[in-house]
């Protein structure tokens, strides 16, 4: 396994600013924890095209976070 410098965040780097809505299968939000001190937004793409990290500061990520929080609370 690779060696990680700090907590095992799922994303490395700032993430993409946006993903085409039509390509999104699912969006997952990981909140800060002992493992990772930052919020992470992970997009699962349709047609088994894998996952991408979305920049949590981007407009699209903020909209997704709001939507998920409204749904959950």
């Amino acid at each position: 396994f690779p060696m990680f410098k700090r907590g095992r965040c799922l994303c490395i780097g700032p993430g993409v600013k946006a993903v085409k809505v039509a390509d999104i299968e699912k969006a997952s939000i990981m909140y800060p924890s002992n493992n990772c001190d930052k919020i992470e937004v992970i997009i699962t793409l349709k047609e088994n095209k894998g996952q991408r990290c979305l920049n949590p500061k981007s407009k699209q990520a903020r909209l997704i976070i709001k939507k998920v929080e409204r749904k959950n609370f």
Epitope: P2, K5, C9, L10, C11, G15, I43, G50, R52
Partner: nanobody, 126 residues
């Protein structure tokens, strides 16, 4: 135009050190993760390290941990790979690459990256 240019390779004796540079133009390092890869003759391209220049997070391959250190200077828009305690098996062409939206689990996979440099040769003699 996006460009990555590596430099700093060369011939070094086993146990020696080299520092590779990866100068980026056409984009800012802040927006990308920078990966370092190497390819020895007849072998697959291998992920060595990855750094997020925005927060300094790093990932290293087991084969180089404790010997190689990735860093970046955002003011110079340049990433670095400090290679210490070099071994003959580190001989390869070294490439830097830039990728966006990477999961940490994908950080050492060459398919994850969008842009590549032309490579710099590192030869470690015994």
């Amino acid at each position: 135009e996006v460009q990555l240019v590596e430099s700093g390779g060369g011939l070094v004796q086993a146990g020696g050190s080299l520092r590779l540079s990866c100068a980026a133009s056409g984009f800012t390092l802040d927006d990308y993760a920078i990966g370092w890869f190497r390819q020895a003759p007849g072998k697959e391209r291998e992920g060595v390290s990855c750094i997020s220049s925005i927060d300094g997070d790093t990932v290293y391959a087991d084969s180089v941990k404790g010997r190689f250190t990735a860093s970046s200077d955002n003011a110079k828009n340049t990433a670095y790979l400090q290679m210490n305690s070099l071994k003959p098996e580190d001989t390869a062409v070294y490439y830097c690459a830039a990728g966006q939206g990477l999961l940490t689990a994908q950080a050492l996979r060459w398919e994850s990256y969008d842009y590549w440099g032309q490579g710099t040769q590192v030869t470690v003699s015994s």
